[in-house]
Amino acid sequence: KFSKQSWGLENEALIVRCPRQGKPSYTVDWYYSQTNKSIPTQERNRVFASGQLLKFLPAAVADSGIYTCIVRSPTFNRTGYANVTIYKKQSDCNVPDYLMYSTVSGSEKNSKIYCPTIDLYNWTAPLEWFKNCQALQGSRYRAHKSFLVIDNVMTEDAGDYTCKFIHNENGANYSVTATRSFTVKDEQGFSLFPVIGAPAQNEIKEVEIGKNANLTCSACFGKGTQFLAAVLWQLNGTKITDFGEPRIQQEEGQNQSFSNGLACLDMVLRIADVKEEDLLLQYDCLALNLHGLRRHTVRLSRKNPIDHHS
C-alpha cells in the first residue's frame, strides 16, 4: 500500500497531500478508511478535502487514522493512503521524538534550517522561530522565506528548532508548528567561484534516437560544506520543472562529492526515449554560489548507427 505518515497537534491546522500524484485537473476523492466514509469538500466542515489536499482546520485527536485518497486519473484510478496522527499539546517544553521532522546539519558556512511541510500551507512571512522553546532574538538569526539562517554558527547552536506560522483559509487563521533537530559540524573551509568540471563548454553529446541519454553537470565550489551552492540544468534558458517535458528530468537531489578535498556537486539530466526535437534544444549546465554563476552549454547530435555492411 502506498502510504505516507503525517502528524500534527490538536487545535492546529494540519494539511496532508495525497501521496499519489496527479495533474491539477484530476479529481481526488478522500475517504476515512476505517468507515469508508467520504470526506466532504465543503469548506464549512472542520475536516474537508480540497483536491490533492486533506485539510484539518483545526485538527483534533479523534481525527487520527488512515485516510484513503483516490486520484481519478485516466486509464486507472490511483490509490494512496495518508496515515494521520494528531497528538495532544505537551504542557512542558520538550518536543517528543514522534513530533520531530528529519534532522538537518549545518556548519559555519551553511546554516539553513527549512520549516518542514510549510509549502502545503497558505502562509505569509515572517516565520517565527524558537529554539528549545525560546523565541530566537538577535542579529545572528534571520528568518528568510521558509527557512532560518544562523550567522557564525557555533556548536551551541545545535538543538531543536520550531517554526511557527499562521495558515489562512477563507479569512480564518490557524496556527501551525513544526520542529526539527539541528546539528553542527565543525568544519574549516572556503568557497571559490564555481568551476564546472563537466560538461566542457559547447560540448556536443552524441545520442541515439529512441534511447535514453544522461547528461551530468558537475562543479566544485571550494572546501568544506558550502553555503548556497547549487548545480542545475536549464533547457533553452528555462528551468527543467517549468519546461514541461516529462521525459526530461533532473535527478532528484544533488550528489555531493569531495574531490581532492573540494566540495563538488553534480546533477544528472535524464532524457528518456530521445526524440528528434530534443536535438534542437540548448542544454545549459549552471553552477552558482555566493561568488556568482558559471554556465556551460551542451547540444545533442544524432549518433549515426554503425554501418555493419561493407
Partner: antibody, heavy 120, light 111 residues
C-alpha cells in the same frame, strides 16, 4: 535500445497454471506502468492486466481472481501468473509499456514480440 | 465498460491514394485535462502492434507525417494521406480513459 522480451509461454491443460515473464531494458523501468495485452489467433487485442509504479494492480473482469501481475524493479521485470487457465485464454501475450510517472500518457509505445500460451 | 466500434472492417486501398478509418466510442473520451484518451495502433502481418497516434492526434516518434489522427469526444478518424504498400495490416483504435479497450480492427490491404 528500448525493448521488452517475453518468456514463459507454452502448452498447458485446462485448469493449469503458467507464469509469464517480461524483461525490460533501455529505459527507467520503475517509472512506467506495465501492461499485458493478449491476442487470440485471428482475433483482436484484449488488455488483461496492468501494474503501476507503486505496485497497485488492475484487471478486467474476465481474468480477475485468476491472473496476478507483479513487478520486480531491481530486475527490470514484470510477471503474469495465470491460474485456472481456460481454453479461452489461448493467445499470444504481449508485454507493453504504459503511462510514465503516474500521469504522463504517451500511448502504449513499446511492445514485446509476444509469447504464445496454448490451453488445451 | 467503454465499447469501441471501428469501421470499415476491411479497407482495400490503392497506393498513392488517401485512406480513412473511423472509430466510435460508447462514451466521451475527452478528459478534464483537455486530452482525448484515444490511440491508434498498426499491426503489420506477423508483427507486434505498434503505436501510431496517441491522445487523439499526437503522432508517435518515428511515425511518418502521412498518418494523422483527428476527432474529439466519441468520434475519431485516422487518415493516411497517401497510402504506401508498407501500410498494410490491421489498424486498431484503443481508449485509455477507463482501463484499456480496443476496437475490433480494420484490415487494410492493397487492391
Amino acid at each position: 535500445e528500448v525493448q521488452l522480451v517475453e518468456s514463459g509461454g507454452g502448452w498447458v491443460q485446462p485448469g493449469g497454471s503458467l507464469r509469464l515473464s517480461c524483461a525490460a531494458s533501455g529505459f527507467t523501468f520503475s517509472s512506467y506502468d506495465m501492461y499485458w495485452v493478449r491476442q487470440a489467433t485471428g482475433k483482436g487485442l484484449e488488455w488483461v492486466s496492468g501494474i503501476d509504479t507503486v505496485g497497485d494492480t488492475y484487471y478486467p473482469d474476465s481474468v480477475k481472481g485468476r491472473f496476478t501481475i507483479s513487478r520486480e524493479n531491481a530486475k527490470n521485470s514484470v510477471y503474469l501468473q495465470m491460474n485456472t487457465l481456460r481454453a479461452g485464454d489461448t493467445a499470444v501475450y504481449y508485454c507493453v509499456r504504459g503511462i510514465y510517472g503516474d500521469f504522463y500518457y504517451y500511448g502504449l509505445d513499446v511492445w514485446g514480440h509476444g509469447t504464445t500460451v496454448t490451453v488445451s | 465498460d467503454i465499447v469501441m466500434t471501428q469501421s470499415p472492417l476491411s479497407l482495400p486501398v490503392t497506393p498513392g491514394e488517401p485512406a480513412s478509418i473511423s472509430c466510435r466510442s460508447s462514451q466521451s473520451l475527452l478528459y478534464s485535462d483537455g486530452n482525448n484518451y484515444l490511440d491508434w495502433y498498426l499491426q503489420k502481418p506477423g508483427q507486434s502492434p505498434h503505436l501510431l497516434i496517441y491522445l487523439g492526434s499526437n503522432r508517435a516518434s518515428g511515425v511518418p507525417d502521412r498518418f494523422s489522427g483527428s476527432g474529439s469526444g466519441t468520434d475519431f478518424t485516422l487518415k493516411i494521406s497517401r497510402v504506401e504498400a508498407d501500410d498494410v495490416g490491421v489498424y486498431y483504435c484503443m481508449q485509455a480513459l477507463q482501463t484499456l479497450t480496443f476496437g475490433g480492427g480494420t484490415k487494410v490491404e492493397i487492391k
